[in-house]
Interface confidence: low
């Protein structure tokens, strides 16, 4: 028997520095977690103690903090090289700055293979990107070889900016021939490493013949056997065992997100490459693990540029950006409109001639808007200003909801109106009329939504059984501010870009902004 240790991360999302327990900015260092310096300590400890170790990343290193905003992926290549990752799969967020924003900072600089079997380049890009990412890689580990085959969510064109010269194929269809190829090369230990979410990970384990282990990402899935060490609630045991269609037991793993845990899986193979046993657990990277001093020093050196960036002007406002709670928790506020407009703008993807865009709607809890921005400071808007407005380090995510769920959400928005509570919704691509004289749960008298399947966008009545795409904060997608119906009834959830980054990019693009209060949210009395 031959034993392999797989160390894995996924959805790190730019958390190069240690973070608080909820993966936001580290405040009290003695209680902070994760970060590449601490990760390196643990990885090196395991590498010294065990013979056959692979360090893998399942995608979405890009996007999530000011590190990515400023360094645009160069930081990912630099620190992943420093940690000596063995392989990485491409995630959807790796395309956030377009193909060029992937090629130059990461693909050309990485000293490890970057993989995806289901992304096919065409046209002029094919020769430009050739060899910079691979469908699979055979890695020597000790005196054996292990095949790693990559995959990426086929939804990436809707979630990021891969352009028109990359085709995202069905994962299972694309993986099978690559695994078959590895088999003909006498590689009998094969890991599928990819970024399509836990449901697809399980399907790959079930359907792709010859895959021995699946290491996934995208869905931020936390798996754990025994008592979990922090706040995350396990979605299942670690590893999650799937019985394949040909009768094998295939371990599937994921390690939550944000570099908070290091996935740790031990696999025992027989001489024919069959998995005999698998066990392990994610390791919580808490303050009991010291940060490696050399990596930490490097982080501090790279940090200097970030501090300078946060005070630079991104753009100007010529109007007061009213992010006050007395506005945003009671009525339409122009800061809410600005943020929602930025959220939609960030999700412009013209992928089909039938649609002007794949999503037109935004909702945003008023309680998530924490500060106004005064235009009398020469109109200047900085990252620092935006960090005061959006201090929680969240993301703006894409969900799919039925109209009936949206209707419930808008009823919840005003079910206890007048108490300055955070659930009052700011909107984009939505016209809502409330009648507060009616009883809670029956106060939405008009709800019109902007069509997407149209060449001239206009507002149509919400249909209860229609499925709609909506951009919203991850806080709401997770049921925050009492929006349990969103969490319980959402049909799909894809994590998006860092909230401040979305707004800062929009302001930089627009240069001068002047959001208005324009009748997106109205109040009426009497019949409709």
């Amino acid at each position: 028997a031959w034993e392999l240790t797989i160390l894995h991360t996924n959805d790190v999302h730019s958390r190069l520095e240690q973070t608080s327990e909820d993966s936001s900015k580290c405040v009290n260092a003695s209680r902070c977690m994760g970060g590449v310096a601490r990760l390196f300590t643990k990885v090196q400890q395991i590498r010294r103690a065990e013979p056959n170790v692979l360090l893998l990343d399942a995608g979405d290193q890009y996007q999530g903090t000011i590190w990515f905003t400023v360094y645009k992926g160069a930081e990912v290549a630099h620190f992943m090289n420093a940690l000596r990752y063995d392989a990485m799969a491409l995630g959807n967020h790796e395309f956030d700055n377009g193909v060029e924003g992937l090629i130059e900072p990461l693909l050309k600089e990485a000293k490890f293979p970057i993989l995806s079997a289901n992304i096919k380049a065409k046209g002029p890009l094919a020769s430009q990107i050739s060899g910079l990412y691979l469908p699979y890689k055979v890695l020597p580990v000790g005196d054996e070889v292990v095949g790693i085959v990559g995959y990426t969510s086929k939804e990436t064109p809707f979630l990021s900016n891969p352009g028109t010269n990359l085709v995202f194929e069905d994962e299972i269809t694309a993986l099978q021939p690559e695994v078959d190829k590895l088999k003909t090369l006498n590689v009998n230990k094969i890991i599928a490493l990819g970024h399509s979410g836990f449901e697809m990970d399980k399907l790959i384990a079930q359907k792709v013949r010859g895959v021995d282990v699946v290491v996934g990402g995208h869905s931020n899935t936390f798996l754990y056997t025994g008592n979990p060490p922090s706040k995350e609630v396990p979605a299942g045991k670690y590893p999650f065992i799937v019985t394949s269609d040909d009768g094998r037991k295939v371990p599937v793993v994921q390690a939550y997100a944000f570099g908070k845990y290091l996935g740790y899986l031990k696999i025992e193979f027989d001489e024919r490459g069959n998995v005999i046993s698998s066990h392990g657990n994610p390791i919580l990277l808490n303050s009991s693990i010291p940060e490696d001093p050399s990596i930490k020093a490097d982080i501090n050196k790279w940090r200097i540029k970030l501090d300078n960036y946060s005070t630079q002007e991104l753009g100007k406002t010529i109007v007061y950006l009213d992010g006050s709670s007395q506005s945003c928790r009671f009525r339409e506020c122009n800061m809410g409109n600005l943020i929602c407009d930025a959220m939609i703008n960030n999700n412009l993807r013209h992928t089909d001639e039938m649609f002007w865009n794949h999503v037109s709607m935004c909702i945003l809890n008023g309680g998530g808007i924490r500060s106004p921005i005064d235009e009398r400071n020469n109109g200047t808007i900085t990252w620092e200003n935006l960090a005061a407005v959006l201090p929680f380090g969240g993301t703006f995510d894409l969900v799919q909801l039925k109209g009936s769920t949206l209707k419930k959400a808008f009823e919840h928005s005003v079910h206890r109106y007048g108490q300055s509570t955070g659930e009052f919704l700011q909107v984009g691509g939505i016209h809502v009329v409330y009648d507060l004289s009616r009883k809670p749960g029956d106060r939405v008298v008009k709800l019109d939504v902007l069509c997407t399947k149209c060449r001239v966008p206009s507002y149509d009545p919400l249909k209860m059984d229609e499925v709609y795409k909506v951009i919203l904060p991850n806080f709401l997608a997770n049921g925050g501010d009492g929006f349990q119906m969103i969490k319980d009834e959402l049909l799909r959830h894809d994590s998006g870009d860092q909230d401040i980054n979305v707004v800062s990019t929009y302001i930089s693009k627009m240069k001068v902004i002047y959001p208005a209060v324009e009748g997106r949210i109205k109040f009426s009395t009497g019949s409709h």
Epitope: D352, C454, R455, V456, K463, L491
Partner: antibody
Framework: QVQLVQSGAEVKKPGASVKVSCKAS????????INWVRQATGQGLEWMGW????????GYAQKFQGRVTITRNTSISTAYMELSSLRSEDTAVYYC??????????????WGQGTTVTVSS | DIQMTQSPSSLSASVGDRVTITCRAS??????LAWYQQKPGKAPKLLLY???TLASGVPSRFSGSGSGTDYTLTISSLQPEDFATYYC?????????FGGGTELEIK
């Protein structure tokens, strides 16, 4: 021209399943919903469910929930309706129909020729 | 679920007559209503949608009106090819139910 062509008549025993196909041509298959509607002899039309071929999203009438499965194969521009646990009252002509979804102007503008399914012991 | 009730269920008329068929929904369907014509052994054919918009290629003698829960299909001057069964269907919230049909026969 735009058309939907359905598979041929089927005779099934109670308790069995039937799978009817609907091949689209003359338009972009992934841009329109395909719906399924049935009509028992001498009776009215009954809507069963829909699929949006682009992403495979489906919606079913509560009456058929759990018994009907609508799928698609985009590579051959074909939608399928499978009805399980057949009973004699499922004897009907089954139609597929394209639903326009442009700008909220909703209607079934193109229909298949119909597939007769007979359930008999 | 919204139920659609059509009346009359059958009706005899002569060529040249003006004919009106009504469709009542059990709830407001906000003009999301279509009308179809079906001849024996054939698939239904779209006549009108959004309650009053004539489908492509449909003669102008067919018209639709109504709002809220009550809708009508009118044939201003019956032609021999109009003898068929007519159905309304709403598209407000699923299930997208059809009316029971109105059989229009030659007097």
């Amino acid at each position: 021209q735009v058309q939907l062509v359905q598979s041929g008549a089927e005779v099934k025993k109670p308790g069995a399943s039937v799978k009817v196909s609907c091949k689209a041509s003359g338009y972009t298959f992934t841009s329109y919903d395909i719906n399924w509607v049935r009509q028992a002899t001498g009776q009215g039309l009954e809507w069963m469910g829909w699929i949006y071929p682009r992403d495979g999203f489906t919606g079913y009438a509560q009456k058929f929930q759990g018994r009907v499965t609508i799928t698609r194969n985009t590579s051959i521009s074909t939608a399928y309706m499978e009805l399980s646990s057949l009973r004699s009252e499922d004897t009907a002509v089954y139609y597929c129909a394209r639903k326009e979804g442009y700008r909220g102007d909703w209607y079934f503008d193109v229909w298949g020729q119909g597939t007769t399914v007979t359930v008999s012991s | 679920d919204i139920q659609m009730t059509q009346s009359p269920s059958s009706l005899s008329a002569s060529v040249g007559d003006r004919v009106t068929i009504t469709c009542r929904a059990s709830g407001n369907v906000h003009n999301y209503l279509a009308w179809y014509q079906q001849k024996p052994g054939k698939a239904p054919k779209l006549l009108l949608y959004n309650a009053k918009t004539l489908a492509s290629g449909v003669p102008s003698r067919f018209s639709g009106s109504g709002s809220g829960t009550d809708y009508t299909l009118t044939i201003s001057s019956l032609q021999p090819e109009d003898f068929a069964t007519y159905y309304c269907q709403h598209f407000w919230s699923t299930p997208w139910t059809f009316g029971g049909g109105t059989e229009l026969e030659i007097k």
